[in-house]
Structures are given as C-alpha cells and as structure tokens.
Interface confidence: low
C-alpha cells in the first residue's frame, strides 16, 4: 500500500510544490484542545497549467463524541479506549473560483487526498519527506496503475430488494442543489482486519488511513445532505476475530454474524464497514447487504485495492450506497450520471474502471429518497450528540450546534437565503432556515401536512405552527389490522412478507408444521415449539446470497455456517387470529396495549405506536383537547 517509491505506481503525474498562504495576522484565541493543526488553511498548487487555490477547513465532525478505538494489547487482552486530545489533520473544502468544486485532504505529512474541479478529479500525494512544501505528485485517477474493481452485489440480489427498475421517475436535479430534507447522519463503525494491519504496519498508520478514507466518504455524501461520522475503529492488530475469506459474500456474512454478537458490548452504530487487506476473488472489491441500513445487517466489506485511499473510499461510499437502497446505475434504464468526461461513471456504477467516481447519479438520489421514506431509516435522523462533537461547535458543518440557529454548510456551498452562512444565525426577518415546516424562511401554519401517510400502518404528520421541523414520524397503534397482519412500529410484518424479503418473489411461508421445529446449533431440529414464533421457515424462491440454510423436510431456515445464529420470525408478526409474536412467543394482541389509549384523545386524534395521542390536523398534544391556535395564543406565537 505504501511502497518507498510511491510514484512507481503512477503512469503519469505532475510534480508540484504546494505553497501555503499565510493565515490572518490576528487569530481568535483557539481552545488549547484544538492542537497543532489550524482550523482553516489555504494552499496554492500549480498544476495542469493552472494555479489552484484550495481553501480547507478541518473536518471537526469526522469523529463522534464517544469515538472509541479497539485493539489487542501486548498481553493479548482486548482494549477499548477513548483517545484523548483528538486533534487531527483531515480537511475538507473547495477550490477558489470553481463553484461546484470539492476537496478532501490530509495535511499530516505533506498533502494527500483529492480535489475536484469541474469534471476533473485530481489526486495529490507527497513524493518525498519534505512536508507540505515538498515535492508532490498531482495526477488523475486514470493514471494510477490499477486493475478495474467491481462490486460483488449481483443484479439478481438487487432485483427483489429494490423493486422495478424504470427511470421515468428520475428527474435530474441541478447539480448544486442539496435535497431539501433535513441532514441525515450515518454513525459509522470501521473494522480493519489483520491483513490490512500487516500491510500498513502499525496502529498509527491504520488510524491515519481510516480517518483519511472516512473523511473522503463524508465529503462524497455531503452532496446528498448526509454526514458520515466515525464513532468507532477496531483494529485487528493481533488476529482476525472471524474468518476473512477471499469470497466476499462469506466475509460479509461472517462480519454481520460477528457484529450481531458484539452489539451488546460495542458501540451503537448505524453501519459497520470492514476494510480488508485480503484480495477478494476475481475483480470484486466490495460487497454489501442491500437496503440494510439501520438493521442488524447494516454493513459491507471493502478490499483496500488501491495505493491511494480515495480508491477504498469510493468503494466504501458505493457499498454504503447499497446499504442505503441504491442499485447499480447500469441496471436502471435512463439513469443520468452528470459526469461530463468520457469515462465518466458515478459512484454506483457496478465497476469503478480506471478512474475514481466523485458523485451520485440521479437514480441513486431517487433510490436514497425512497429509502428514507421507510420507517427503518429512522436511525439516520438522529445526529451524533451535538453537544459533544469533537472540537466543539463549528459554523459551516451542516450540524446545527450549540449557539447556532442554522447551518447550511460553508459559504461557498450554502444555497439557503434564510441562513447567514458566516455566522450560522438566521437571516434578518427569517423565522427558520431548515425543516419541512419552514417555507420561504417562515414557519408554516398549524395543520399543514408535512409528512403524508405512506401506507396503512403509518399516520400523517402536520406542522404545529411553532416549529420548523415536522413532528417525529409516528405510526398506527401497534396491533391495528393491516394486510394479512397487524401493524408493529410502522411495519406490517407477516410470514409471507418476511419469506419474500429473504427468498425473493417466489418465497412463501412454509407449512405450519415446520414452525414446530426449533433449530439448535449444528442444524439439529428440535420439535418442541408450540407456536410460529421461532425460526423463520420458508419455501420456494431463491436461496439468499451468502447465507447457509438448514433444511428439515420441506422447511428451509436461514442460518450461519456454524449454526449459532438463525433468522427468527420478527417481533410483531401475526401468528394467529388476534395473536402476534412477542418476546419469542405467540401472545394475545393485548400485549401491545396497557390501556384504552384512544379514549384519552377526545375524538380529535388516535393512539400511535408509542401509546400516545396523535392529534388530527390543528389539535394540540398531548390529549388533543385544545386547538393549536388556542394553545399558541395563550403562550405567544413562536418559540
């Protein structure tokens, strides 16, 4: 990965000597924890006949507040610690004079990373030990000698998960406009296997590369109004915790099984990504579970296939895209990738070819917005604890933090006239700048629909006239009848639907007798269960990729290779008339309800999945007894 002569792996490059622009003479006093690397820095690079001025700011949101590192100590014990003084040297920014430019670089030992100008992606890295003023190579990704990499997620596995693939719905959105919804946050946990550790040689080198990779991934996702925040890094410096196979589907299965076992004693995170030094079979460099973000299967495996970390960053962004419901671009008829150069591919192209992609296609964005409408995506709505973001509040990072009224990103990216991007305060006369109940810088009136009902287990939400955000997504009361089942936390789980999700359109629930088997380790069947709430038993369809199965008679149960984990019938699944699976047993519907909740809603609302009143348009919580207008009049109109 880091040979002594890095340029030996480049076909064509230009030597540049970056020049750091002097900072302002008077600097505000910085808190001592901000360390050696300045908050903002600018460099001039003479490359491809141009002088590029890069304006960079430290990515203060790279690490979550509870960021941990896990490794094996010399005595063989596993150690998890929260590193103190988390100063770092990872920056993001733009190129002066280029409106749609982007930059993501580390300045730790010279400049390393990428900057994008128009349709050109330039990579930069040091050629010697001369630091930031020393000789650097600037080159384009197609001049990096490497083999093309492909994604292992097959079209077959995508089909059943993503639904029909027509592009009539994909309307290109202007390149400079972010989706108008709230920012979403992926709290990321990265695992680095022993092969990668051996390749890089030390914990410090691994940490540096991972932070560089996540910094790049975060920059790529900011175009979608997403932030990617690293909450944990695990380095297998002694030995692998599970078998990392050259078969990426096996490795992914092992990662997800291991993650499920670790969940109780490791970070709560939205997504886990393995970076491996193992060479996957064939040209595959990544593999992911599709539409799995926020579920127990939210993860992917990535081969560190390129000398430049931008390579594995693009792979990780691609596999995370699958986790977020995106299909390969070439599978979608009429999919538009705005890349303008000849070999232009977007991030969700099935193969990365000879150049690194730098943007998401229109159809990727449409898939993403569709995924965000699902109840399961709720884990992305919660920002990491903003009171503790490493480095304290920083204006211009898309996080609305302590002391800020709004944050639309750095001035060069901000397109929000309701927010002053340099102060992160509301523009004069503005009541709000963000949120679905904010229109033209004003809070929408009470009772206006802000989140329509998605299906029969959902409830619609209305603006309350006071807050710019739409109220939290709420669902029909658990136990409300829905097609073939009973609503549970916004879903309508049935055996048939679960079997289809795993086994594809031909999947269906197995015979009732199958459910009297429990599968014990080693695929041994134990006929003792008296209900249908044990192992999910299916028939028909296609065996899911990367899953082992236990077969008893005509009953098919999904399991892991060692038989220690099997796919359960999910909580809330109908197991009989007026009965649902709850705590692994078939129980009466009344387990959902402690009291007659709806009676407390004064006929102006219904009970939701949290056993709280969900008021009709214009009525005020908690009991829908008063009109919102009355409540506001009594307490002043705005917060």
């Amino acid at each position: 990965i880091a040979p002594s002569r890095p340029w030996a792996l480049m076909e064509q490059y230009e030597v540049v000597l970056p020049w750091r622009l002097p900072g302002p003479r008077v600097r505000r006093a910085l808190p001592s924890h901000l360390g050696l690397h300045p908050e903002r820095v600018s460099y001039v690079l003479g490359a491809t006949g141009h002088n590029f001025t890069l304006h960079l700011r430290k990515n203060r949101d790279l690490l979550g507040s509870g960021y941990t590192e896990t490794y094996t100590a010399a005595n063989g014990s596993e150690v998890t610690e929260q590193p103190r003084g988390q100063d770092h040297c990872f920056y993001q920014g733009h190129v002066e004079g280029y409106p749609d430019s982007a930059a993501s670089l580390s300045t730790c030992a010279g400049l390393r990373g990428f900057f994008q100008v128009g349709s050109d992606l330039h990579l930069i890295e040091p050629l010697d030990e001369g630091g930031e003023g020393g000789r650097h190579a600037v080159y384009q990704a197609e001049h990096l000698l490497q083999t093309a990499g492909t994604c292992g997620v097959s079209d077959d596995s995508l089909g059943s998960l993503l639904g029909p693939r027509t592009a009539a719905v994909f309307r290109p959105r202007p390149g400079d406009s972010l989706p108008s919804r709230e920012t979403r946050y992926v709290e990321l946990y990265v695992v680095v296997d022993n092969a990668e550790f051996q390749m890089l040689g030390s914990e410090a080198a691994v940490r540096h590369r991972v932070l560089e990779v996540v910094n790049h991934v975060d920059k790529l996702y900011q175009k979608l109004n997403f932030r990617v925040v690293l909450v944990g890094l695990e380095i297998w410096n002694s030995q692998d915790r599970f078998h990392v196979s050259p078969d990426p589907s096996v490795t992914l299965e092992n990662l997800l099984t291991w993650q499920a076992r670790q969940r109780t004693r490791r970070h709560l995170h939205d997504n886990v990504q393995l970076i491996t030094g193992v060479d996957f079979t064939g040209t595959t460099v990544g593999f992911a579970r599709v539409s799995a973000m926020c579920s127990h299967s939210s993860g992917a495996v990535n081969q560190d296939h390129s000398k430049n970390p931008v390579g594995v960053a693009c792979t990780m962004a691609h596999e995370m895209g699958h986790n977020l419901g995106m299909d390969h671009d070439e599978n979608v008829q009429g999919c538009r990738c705005q890349e303008r150069f000849e070999a232009g591919r977007c991030i969700m192209a099935g193969s990365i070819g000879s150049s690194f992609p730098r943007m998401f296609s229109d159809c990727s964005q449409a898939y993403l917005e569709s995924f965000l409408e699902r109840p399961q995506s709720v884990c992305l709505a919660n920002a990491p604890d903003l009171s503790h973001l490493v480095g304290g509040p920083v204006c211009g990072n898309l996080f609305v933090e302590r002391g800020e009224q709004c944050d639309c990103g750095p001035p060069e990216d901000c397109r929000n006239r309701c927010c002053n991007s340099t102060t992160c305060q509301l523009a004069e006369g503005a009541q709000c700048a963000h949120g679905t109940c904010c229109q033209e810088c004003k809070v929408k009136p009470a009772g206006e629909l802000c989140r329509p009902k998605k299906d029969m287990c959902d409830l619609e939400e209305f603006c309350d006239g006071r807050h710019p955000e739409c109220p939290e997504d709420a669902f029909q009361e658990n136990g409300t009848p829905c097609s073939g089942g009973y609503c549970y936390n916004g879903a309508c789980p049935t055996l048939a639907q679960q079997c289809q999700a795993f086994w594809g359109p031909g999947g269906q629930a197995a015979e009732e007798s199958c459910f009297s088997y429990d599968i014990l380790p080693g695929c041994k069947a134990s006929r003792y269960r008296a209900d249908m709430c044990g192992v999910l038993q299916c028939k028909g369809g296609q065996q899911p990729l990367g899953r082992a199965i236990c077969i008893v008679d005509v009953c098919h149960a999904l399991t892991t290779e060692d038989g220690t984990a099997y796919e359960p019938v999910p909580e809330g699944t109908r197991c009989g008339p007026e009965k649902v699976c709850w705590k692994g047993r078939c129980q009466d519907l009344h387990v959902y309800r402690s009291s007659n909740c709806s009676a407390q809603c004064h006929n102006h609302g219904v009970c939701n999945h949290k056993q709280e009143c969900h008021c009709h348009a214009g009525w005020a919580p908690p009991h829908c007894a008063k009109l919102l207008t009355e409540v506001h009049a009594a307490s002043g109109s705005l917060p």
């Epitope: 109780t264 014990l520 192992v535 220690t564 796919e567 359960p568 909580e571 705590k583 692994g584």
Partner: nanobody, 119 residues
Framework: EVQLVESGGGLVQAGASLKLSCAAS????????MGWFRRAPGKGRESVAT????????YYMDSVKGRFTITRDNAKNTVYLQMNNLKPEDTAVYYC????????????WGQGTQVTVSS
Amino acid sequence: EVQLVESGGGLVQAGASLKLSCAASGRTYDIRVMGWFRRAPGKGRESVATTTWRDNITYYMDSVKGRFTITRDNAKNTVYLQMNNLKPEDTAVYYCAAQTEDSAQYIYWGQGTQVTVSS
C-alpha cells in the same frame, strides 16, 4: 444484559474428567437456550452441547456424545458441562453462551476457560 462467567478448566491426562461451570447473572429470566462452545488452536468454533432453559432439550455434537453431559441448576442460574473420558482432541478454550427469548442468536458470551488434555 446477561453476564456469564465460566470456571473449572485445567490441565488433565487423557481419560480423566473435568466439570465446567457457567454462572449467569443479570437478566437471567430472559434466557432461552444456554450452550457450551469450544475453539481449538487453528480451528473454527464448534458447538459442543446446548440446553433449552425451560424444557431441558439438549443437543450434543457427535464426537462428545456419551462422554459429555450438559446439566443446569435453574435455582443457581448455572449450567454445567461434565466431561468424562477426555481425549487430547478435546483440548480447546471452552466458552459458555446464552440466547435470549427475543433473539435467535447467542448474543452473550463468557470469556472462556482453557481445557488441556495431555496424552
């Protein structure tokens, strides 16, 4: 959360016996299945023996049938593995694991206890 602590491992001669104990604490009322697993040097983890907490349905891997017995004492929240006629190939780290009512996976694991059988 459920905490699991194993004890009883050690070094013995081939043909000897050992009894491993696994004491569970915390939300033990959630436990549905408990089991013993082992990992020998250079090998993957194997499921040795498991028992359902309520109705005592047991499972043994073929190579230990007739030699190992899994029992439990619900009052003490402890599961035992009686290992007789031990063989050198039984040498491994033995782990206790628990599966809860609302999970289909062994999500709680002990730290492991070393069993070494010399010939």
